[in-house]
Interface confidence: low
């Protein structure tokens, strides 16, 4: 008789999850000399240990501590780019501006980007059928707790001027419930961080509004100011031109507003 299995509301573990994590780890350590010391088998064992045999609604940050320890990485604290609801452009930017880093440019972020995973209580099986959805099932699921943990650590490491890329096409440009709004904003360290600079990315070519005056941006400014961190905001009217000007800042067309 087949054993009863919990049906969750979210998609199951990404197929070939163990192989994907291991392959990504090998690839990352090959191309980042400063991480060449990392033993990818140990990284996978620590990752697995965080959720295998545990109830997928009862995962804690402590479960991920062995993985966090193995994945400890120093990125230049003044070169951090946070993002919310605009991952692709943020990643394009760090590919061009190669001395800046998103969370997904670090080993742990790179390993887990776009993947889903969960286990089952008291069995060593990975659940490929379904995993808990953050809203419909529970927030303390393996994926959500992982991103909360690494995002907190990433924000805590930031210093000087921290940049955040926000999606100006969304109804809530700054969303208090996003990872940026609920975790990263609150873990920037006022002793180290002087300024949070928001880049609001416009979607439409004809959109000339000042989205820095948006009520949700004002809300972000208020939260940041209360934490004794300065806030500044820039409209990026032309994201395509913005990337081009990052690559070729001396281009004559880059002196005008982007």
């Amino acid at each position: 008789v087949p054993r009863w299995r919990q049906q969750w509301s979210g998609p199951g573990t990404t197929k070939r999850f163990p192989e994907t994590v291991l392959a990504r780890c090998v690839k990352y350590t090959e191309i980042h000399p400063e991480m060449r010391h990392v033993d990818c088998q140990s990284v996978w064992d620590a990752f697995k240990g965080a959720f295998i045999s545990k109830h997928p609604c009862n995962i804690t940050e402590e479960d991920y501590q062995p993985l966090m320890k193995l994945g400890t990485q120093t990125v230049p604290c003044n070169k951090i780019l946070l993002w919310s609801r605009i991952k692709d452009l943020a990643h394009q930017f760090t590919q061009v501006q190669r001395d800046m880093f998103t969370l997904e440019d670090t080993l742990l972020g790179y390993l887990a980007d776009d993947l889903t995973w969960c286990g089952e209580f008291n069995t060593s099986k990975i659940n490929y059928q379904s995993c808990p959805d953050w809203r419909k099932d529970c927030s303390n699921n393996p994926v959500s707790v992982f991103w909360k943990t690494v995002s907190r650590r990433f924000a805590e490491a930031a210093c000087d001027v921290v940049h955040v890329m926000l999606n100006g096409s969304r109804s809530k440009i700054f969303d208090k419930n996003s990872t940026f709004g609920s975790v990263e904003v609150h873990n920037l360290q006022p002793e180290k961080v002087q300024t949070l600079e928001a880049w609001v990315i416009h979607g439409g070519r004809e959109d000339s509004r000042d989205l820095c005056q948006d009520p949700t941006i004002k809300e972000l400014e208020s939260i940041i100011s209360k934490r004794n961190i300065q806030f500044s905001c820039k409209n990026i009217y032309r994201p395509d031109k913005f990337l081009q000007c990052v690559k070729n800042p001396e281009d004559s067309s880059c002196t005008s507003e982007i």
Partner: antibody, heavy 119, light 106 residues
Framework: QVQLQQSGAELAKPGASVKMSCKAS????????MNWIKQRPGQGLEWIGY????????EYNQKFKDKATLTADKSSGTAYMQLSSLTSEDSAVYYC????????????WGQGTSVTVSS | QIVLTQSPALMSASPGEKVTMTCSAS?????MYWYQQKPRSSPKPWIY???NLASGVPARFSGSGSGTSYSLTISSMEAEDAATYYC?????????FGGGTKLELK
Amino acid sequence: QVQLQQSGAELAKPGASVKMSCKASGYTFTNYWMNWIKQRPGQGLEWIGYIIPSTDYTEYNQKFKDKATLTADKSSGTAYMQLSSLTSEDSAVYYCSRYPYRGYAMDYWGQGTSVTVSS
Amino acid sequence: QIVLTQSPALMSASPGEKVTMTCSASSSVSYMYWYQQKPRSSPKPWIYLTSNLASGVPARFSGSGSGTSYSLTISSMEAEDAATYYCQQWSTNPWTFGGGTKLELK
């Protein structure tokens, strides 16, 4: 300035092997991936694979897995590609090109090595 | 593997004419890259990350697109633009090129 200098044309018999070279200069050899691309006469481009010289890590297009072997010599700043069990299908120009792993495109290319397989 | 289909395979344009060529991917890719190749020469990087011009590429060139549909546009054709243009994707191994669009001067 950056240069990728490839070895001269090769004429080989079916079943034989050839090993071509790509000498890099003007940049830090170990900081970039080295790609190899095939172009048959009058045809398009086909990616064979890359090597990361700092660690000798390679990744291949499955199609060329048993055909091409990529190596690199850090001390001389030279990448190599060996092609084995040659057939007429392997007659082509082979380019090496460097790739900065976080973005851009393959930004510098060698002049190409022509391989002719004929009995 | 992701197949990139370029169209048209061959086209001609007069000086000053606007030119658009397309590259269609068999499944979604994150970004598209374009290379220019002239006879008896190595390919040159032309556009990266879909819309960014490589160093030295004239501003009359532009790139756009997302998902499975990408294009390269020349706002005003010049004689030196006659060449074959290849699109290429890095999203999935094997990294693949399109079959090329040969652009001739009319």
